[in-house]
């Protein structure tokens, strides 16, 4: 079973992270898939884009996404200088000028178009379940994950340790 | 300061166990996966296991699957590693090392100074 | 399972000489590559985290590069406490350590 602890210990770390730098620390990009192995793909209709989750035909070529990461302070519960150690913080970027959002009031992922600095919106805390197994926790919402409904990304609340284990908020990251 | 502090190494037969203890400080544990690496003497670095922070996943090596467990007690800032049916070829210094990033997996960075393990009749 | 091959095994070089290391994996780890110093006797130490980020209180002659299967680290001018025993690792697919370059001052 995979886990991700302690949602309620860091909300209030989360609130008071600050991104170290200005620039990601690393850069690359990765195909996004589900734990159930379905493509997340991006569509342009209608002048803005669509984010699907779908089993994609044998030949047809996935979606890549740019992945930013960040290094983010947090808050100290046991350290002498103020904070404990690093976070690292992601942003999703799958065209230029286009950051995955979270839409904490509808509950949704969308994509948006914007110039940097990127608001708290599009910065999302990343957990590994192991190295190809990630989370991505909303910055602005601390306990609220990207997940999957219904073929498509929304943001799920995840408020005990037993819902940490589902496995619609992870994702895998390859290169293929 | 981050301290990590290992107990438990020493001289044991082959077949034997020995169950290694890690004590950290200086950082909120429970938000940081946690590994063993082991060194043999004159030799290089092997990554031997790793553990989440909430210690629902483990992984291992696979010469040491089914011989060695990893487990924490974030109560008591502690980790383990249960070595079963040891081998002269476990014989090394047996590093306990923390996760560089909170809840990830990605990079490490505060190791210990290693507690020596010795398999031989 | 990646492997992880660094080249050489044993680097001699001069105080002052701009020093690179190697290292080389089986498939593409995407910048997911840390650099370690280890002097004799004592554990290991982070130098070079994401491939190219100096950890805190890290001389700035040391750097990192590299992307896809090909990574380096470079010291710019060999200092006498530079000499020990240097380790790349891959965090992007498990976790595999190279095994070692040894500096040595000529």
């Known amino acids: 079973a995979f886990g991700i602890s302690g949602v309620q210990k860091y909300t209030r770390a989360l609130h008071d992270s600050s991104i170290t730098g200005i620039s990601p620390i690393t850069e690359y990009l990765a195909s996004l898939s589900t734990y159930n192995d379905q493509s997340i793909t991006f569509a342009l209709e209608d002048e803005s884009y669509e984010i699907y989750v779908e089993d994609l035909k044998k030949d047809e070529k996935k979606d890549k996404v740019l992945l930013s990461y960040y290094e983010s302070q947090h808050p100290s519960n046991e350290s002498g200088d103020g904070v404990d150690g690093k976070m690292l913080m992601v942003t999703l970027s799958p065209t230029k000028d286009f950051w995955l959002h979270a839409n904490n009031k509808e509950h949704s992922v969308e994509l948006h178009k914007c110039e940097k600095p990127l608001p708290d919106q599009a910065f999302f805390v990343l957990h590994n379940m192991h190295s190809n197994c990630v989370s991505f926790e909303c910055k602005t919402d601390p306990g609220v994950f990207i997940g999957v409904k219904d073929n498509h990304l929304a943001l799920i609340k995840v408020d005990s340790s037993e819902n940490l284990c589902t496995e619609n908020i992870l994702f895998k990251l390859s290169e293929t | 300061e981050v301290q990590l502090v290992e107990t438990g190494g020493g001289l044991v037969q082959p077949g034997r166990s020995l169950k290694l203890s890690c004590v950290a400080s200086?950082?909120?544990?429970?938000?940081?996966?946690m590994y063993w690496i082991r060194q043999a003497p004159g030799m290089g670095l092997e990554w031997v296991s790793s553990?989440?922070?909430?210690?629902?996943?483990?992984y291992y090596l696979d010469s040491v699957k089914g011989r060695f467990t990893i487990s924490r007690n974030n109560a008591e800032n502690t980790v383990y590693l249960q070595m079963n049916s040891l081998r002269s070829e476990d014989t090394a210094t047996y590093y306990c090392?923390?996760?560089?990033?909170?809840?990830?997996?990605?990079?490490?960075?505060?190791w210990g100074q290693g507690t020596l393990v010795t398999v031989s009749s | 399972d990646i492997q992880m091959t660094q080249s050489p095994s044993v680097l001699s070089a001069s105080v002052g000489d701009r020093v690179t290391l190697s290292c080389k994996a089986s498939?593409?780890?995407?910048?997911?590559l840390d650099w370690y110093q280890q002097k004799v006797g004592e554990a290991p130490k982070l130098l070079i985290y994401?491939?190219?980020n100096l950890q805190t209180g890290i001389p700035s002659r040391f750097s990192g590069s590299g992307s896809g299967t090909d990574y380096t680290l470079t010291i710019s001018s060999l200092q006498p406490e530079d000499v020990a025993t240097y380790f790349c690792?891959?965090?992007?697919?498990?976790?595999?350590f190279g095994q070692g370059t040894k500096v040595e001052i000529k």
């Open positions: 553990i989440n922070n909430d210690g629902g996943n483990t």
């Open positions: 498939h593409n780890i995407n910048k997911h």
């Open positions: 090392v923390k996760g560089h990033y909170s809840y990830s997996s990605y990079s490490i960075d505060y």
């Open positions: 994401f491939t190219n």
């Open positions: 200086g950082f909120t544990f429970s938000n940081y996966w």
């Open positions: 690792f891959q965090y992007n697919s498990g976790w595999t």
